[in-house]
């Protein structure tokens, strides 16, 4: 091909090539052609004769102002036609007359202000019609019943002001899953407008200034329709009462989106008419008081999003939003509750009472004063089968005994990013008989005891990053009870002292993060009592991160037991010489990181075993000694390996001898070196 199109598997991509005409030298068997972002003004039908197999044609983002009816005659198999972001203004009855197999027609962002006659009458197979971002002032798309298979009609960002039954009755035989009317200036829903449509399942009216009054009228018009999904995001619905959604009583609505409405008052029984509702989006509102009956009637809701729904109006404590006790008691089927980023004063004793199916609860950054978790804090969740609880970013400073004793089903507990500073007696976790993961990273300080985790032997993941960990060197180890642990993160704790039995018995451990500590002394031969082999017995360890620990020595047998190790990170240490057989048992190693150390020599006897099956190597920024003895074997290995070595040309530079300083390692000439073959 003379054009720079890329062709792969019968798909031709000719986008962004400043083309002014359709290429005439592409394979004739292509089924998908992408001509977007070019300078096409016309699509001459003759140019497509050779591409009769096309099922998808995308000519979006060009300057096409007219379409030849013969185009589809040349493309009898065409199913998807995308004309978005062009300059079409008129559609005649002939325009798409031959496009009888189309399932998708995209006309978004053109200049179509009016639809005359019946340009879509032949599209009996059309499923999606996108006319959004045009200048349409009405929903009139024809004068006779048509588009019987249409499922999605997208009319957002037009200038539609009223919905009229006489304009929508062309869809009398259609089942619309999605009628998208967002970002219009609709002020009127004429009687019967939605009944004119055969069946309407989804209606989207986001960014339409409805307000409470017009919302009420809309719902009355939706009565006795097939509506399932209704989206009214950012529709200036500032208050709701027990009449707002009355019309929906005669529907089976399952999804309602009221997000971004600055909703201030949710009156009692506002949603009493929605017993079938399953998904309810209320995020980004401004509810000042949730009354005990505000959510009454929502017996089938499974998902409720209240993120940033309760925000304080001013600095005054008196302006904090209120949630009455028992407000959620009606939500018997609720499984997922998101209450992130709110300004709720605290958790009352019956705040969550009645949520007998709740499995996921996010309370991240939800409270203004949740400093201490007591044995009463979560009493209202005692009868909830909660599996996941997120309590991050709440400035929690203390967890008292039995704080979670009500949550016997809990599997994941996230307490990260708080201000917890205390001795962990182990009583904090009492009752967590099914716990799988505890995330405690990014807190103030945690002092461990032998019983810190004695009551949670089921724990598989424990995250203790940057918590100023104290007493980690006690014996028996605080981690001794955690025989099911697979992930342990102890990074960023400035740990300097640990015992060789710190990880004893953790035979299932797969991931160990110890980066950013101060463990260098433990591996020094001069260490009193000799090096401390704290990794012994971890026969199932897959990932080991020891970055930034100041290591300048590695004992020869330190990785001896790590037969399944796949990834090891020893970057940002001070390693210079590694013992000969240090990696001998790492037969499964896939990734080795030794960047920013002081390695001068990469010899076969040290690195041969480690490099055997590597897929990724990072030894950037080491002061390589470019002599035969030091790197000849390495250079030959580099030039023959399939291992990925990022920035090999730029960041693997010789440091010595002086005449090689700054010279790329891979270009070192090994031809004069003896016995440097990388593979035997």
């Amino acid at each position: 091909s003379t054009t720079k199109c890329t062709v792969s598997h019968e798909v031709a991509d000719c986008s962004h090539l400043k083309l002014t005409q359709v290429p005439d030298d592409l394979p004739t068997n292509i089924t998908v052609l992408n001509l977007t972002h070019n300078q096409l003004r016309r699509l001459p039908a003759a140019n497509f004769t050779r591409y009769s197999q096309l099922t998808s044609l995308d000519v979006g983002f060009n300057t096409i102002s007219k379409l030849e009816p013969e185009l589809c005659q040349k493309l009898p198999m065409l199913k998807v036609l995308n004309l978005q972001h062009n300059e079409l203004s008129q559609l005649s009855d002939k325009t798409f007359a031959f496009c009888t197999n189309l399932t998708e027609l995209h006309l978004m962002s053109n200049s179509i202000q009016k639809i005359k006659n019946n340009p879509f009458v032949k599209q009996k197979n059309l499923i999606t019609l996108d006319l959004s971002h045009n200048g349409l002032s009405s929903t009139k798309l024809g004068t006779q019943v048509q588009l019987e298979n249409l499922q999605e009609l997208l009319l957002s960002n037009n200038k539609i002001q009223a919905l009229k039954s006489e304009e929508l009755d062309i869809f009398a035989n259609s089942s619309l899953k999605k009628l998208e009317l967002s970002s219009n200036q609709i002020k009127e829903f004429s009687p019967g407008c939605f009944h004119a449509i055969g069946r309407l399942f989804g209606l989207f009216l986001n960014n339409v200034q409805l307000g409470p009054s017009l919302t009420e009228k809309l719902c009355l018009e939706l009565a006795n329709t097939s509506i399932r999904n209704l989206s009214l995001s950012n529709s200036q619905l500032s208050t709701t009462s027990n009449t707002t959604f009355l019309g929906l009583k005669w529907t089976n609505l399952t999804m309602l989106d009221l997000s971004y409405n600055n909703l201030n008052v949710v009156g009692n029984d506002s949603f009493a008419w929605l017993p079938q509702l399953e998904y309810f989006f209320l995020e980004y509102n401004n509810i000042q008081h949730l009354f005990s009956h505000s959510l009454h009637g929502l017996f089938n809701v499974r998902y409720l999003n209240l993120k940033r729904s309760f925000t304080k109006q001013s600095i005054s404590l008196a302006s904090l939003p209120k949630i009455d006790d028992f407000s959620f008691q009606w939500l018997k089927c609720l499984e997922h509750l998101n209450m992130e980023d709110n300004d709720i004063p605290g958790i009352k004793s019956n705040m969550f009472t009645g949520l007998i199916n709740l499995k996921y609860l996010s309370l991240s950054n939800s409270f203004t004063s949740l400093r201490t978790l007591t044995n009463e804090t979560f009493v209202s969740l005692a009868h909830s089968p909660l599996h996941i609880l997120n309590l991050t970013k709440n400035k929690i400073s203390k967890i008292e005994s039995d704080a979670f004793s009500w949550l016997g089903h809990l599997e994941v507990l996230d307490l990260g990013l708080n201000e917890i500073g205390q001795e962990l007696t182990g009583q904090e976790w009492r009752g967590l008989e099914n716990i799988f993961e505890i995330y405690l990273s990014y807190n103030k300080y945690l002092q461990l005891t032998r019983n810190s985790f004695a009551l949670v032997p089921s724990l598989q993941r424990l995250m203790l990053r940057r918590v100023a960990l104290k007493n980690v060197d006690s014996s028996p180890s605080p981690f001794q009870p955690l025989r099911n642990l697979t992930i342990l993160d102890l990074s960023n704790n400035n740990i300097a002292n640990i015992n060789d039995d710190m990880l004893e018995g953790l035979e299932k451990l797969e991931i160990l993060d110890l980066q950013h500590n101060n463990l260098a002394r433990l591996w020094k031969h001069a260490n009193p009592g000799g090096p401390i082999y704290f990794l012994k017995g971890l026969s199932h360890l897959h990932i080991l991160n020891l970055e930034s620990n100041g290591f300048d020595e590695i004992p020869v047998e330190v990785f001896k037991d790590l037969f399944e190790l796949k990834i090891i990170d020893l970057g940002l240490n001070n390693l210079n010489t590694l013992p000969a057989s240090v990696f001998n048992n790492q037969v499964s190693l896939k990734s080795l990181n030794l960047q920013k150390n002081l390695i001068t020599s990469v010899e076969k006897k040290v690195f041969g075993p480690a490099f055997r099956n590597l897929t990724e190597l990072d030894m950037r920024f080491n002061p390589f000694d470019c002599t035969c003895e030091s790197i000849a074997w390495f250079v030959n290995w580099i030039n023959e390996t399939h291992t990925n070595i990022p920035e090999l040309s730029s960041h693997y530079l010789c440091n010595t001898p002086p005449h090689y300083h700054g010279f790329p390692v891979r270009l070192f000439d090994t031809s004069s070196c003896k016995d440097s073959a990388p593979f035997e």
Epitope: A454, P457, E504, G537
Partner: antibody, heavy 119, light 107 residues
Framework: QVQLVQSGAEVKKPGASVKVSCKAS????????IHWVRQAPGQGLEWMGE????????NYNEKFKTRVTMTRDTSISTAYMELSRLRSDDTAVYYC????????????WGQGTLVTVSS | DIQMTQSPSSLSASVGDRVTITCRAS??????LAWYQQKPGKAPKRLIY???TLADGVPSRFSGSGSGTEFTLTISSLQPEDFATYYC?????????FGQGTKLEIK
């Protein structure tokens, strides 16, 4: 199943030493600490200390620290408790015990070894 | 060191009686308390751990309660095989001291 089998009864003279063994089976010996508890005739139970079979690290009850030595031989899955400078009030049944999955209890006990100190 | 004080030191009761034994710690041991039953010439047998968790194979007539410094072992309806000596033991910090024992005798 987990079993702790102790050595037989011993009679010792005051001032002598006694070494009681505890052979473990049914689990990996090096993964659980072994505790020693004694019981004088007609008296209560007294915790003496614990040993980590993996590295030999020990936590003693201060009361016995100067006289007791706890050791282990991992090759034969056996822990030992040696008590020196025996006195008549050291006459007792000496038990080894082991924690379970829950480390705050002793579900497993040896059958006990009676040590009699008599001149 | 934490001292454990058991009361009473001995107790006479009849089959079918409800019996309560108390154990007091000299410091806060949270719920790290175990109860054992011992019969003459035998090693102790674990009944309850973590103050209230019943060990496997132990009849449900045994129950434990308490937290902090005050703990109780209750036998709801004494059976002939329950006549023995009962000990509490804490597991908060070494040394893991035992109570002096409560001898439960047949009336």
């Amino acid at each position: 199943q987990v079993q702790l089998v102790q050595s037989g009864a011993e009679v010792k003279k005051p001032g002598a030493s006694v070494k009681v063994s505890c052979k473990a089976s049914g689990y990996t010996f090096t993964t659980y600490w072994i505790h020693w508890v004694r019981q004088a005739p007609g008296q209560g139970l007294e915790w003496m200390g614990e040993i980590n079979p993996n590295n030999g690290r020990i936590n003693y009850n201060e009361k016995f620290k100067t006289r007791v030595t706890m050791t282990r031989d991992t090759s034969i899955s056996t822990a030992y408790m040696e008590l020196s400078r025996l006195r008549s009030d050291d006459t007792a049944v000496y038990y080894c015990a082991r924690v379970g999955v829950m480390i705050t209890t002793f579900p497993y006990w040896g059958q006990g070894t009676l040590v009699t100190v008599s001149s | 060191d934490i001292q454990m004080t058991q009361s009473p030191s001995s107790l006479s009761a009849s089959v079918g009686d409800r019996v309560t034994i108390t154990c007091r710690a000299s410091g806060n041991i949270h719920n790290y308390l175990a109860w054992y039953q011992q019969k003459p010439g035998k090693a102790p047998k674990r009944l309850i751990y973590n103050a209230k968790t019943l060990a496997d194979g132990v009849p449900s007539r045994f129950s434990g309660s308490g937290s902090g410094t005050e703990f109780t072992l209750t036998i709801s309806s004494l059976q002939p095989e329950d006549f023995a000596t009962y000990y509490c033991q804490h597991f908060w910090s070494t040394p893991f001291t035992f109570g002096q024992g409560t001898k439960l005798e047949i009336k």
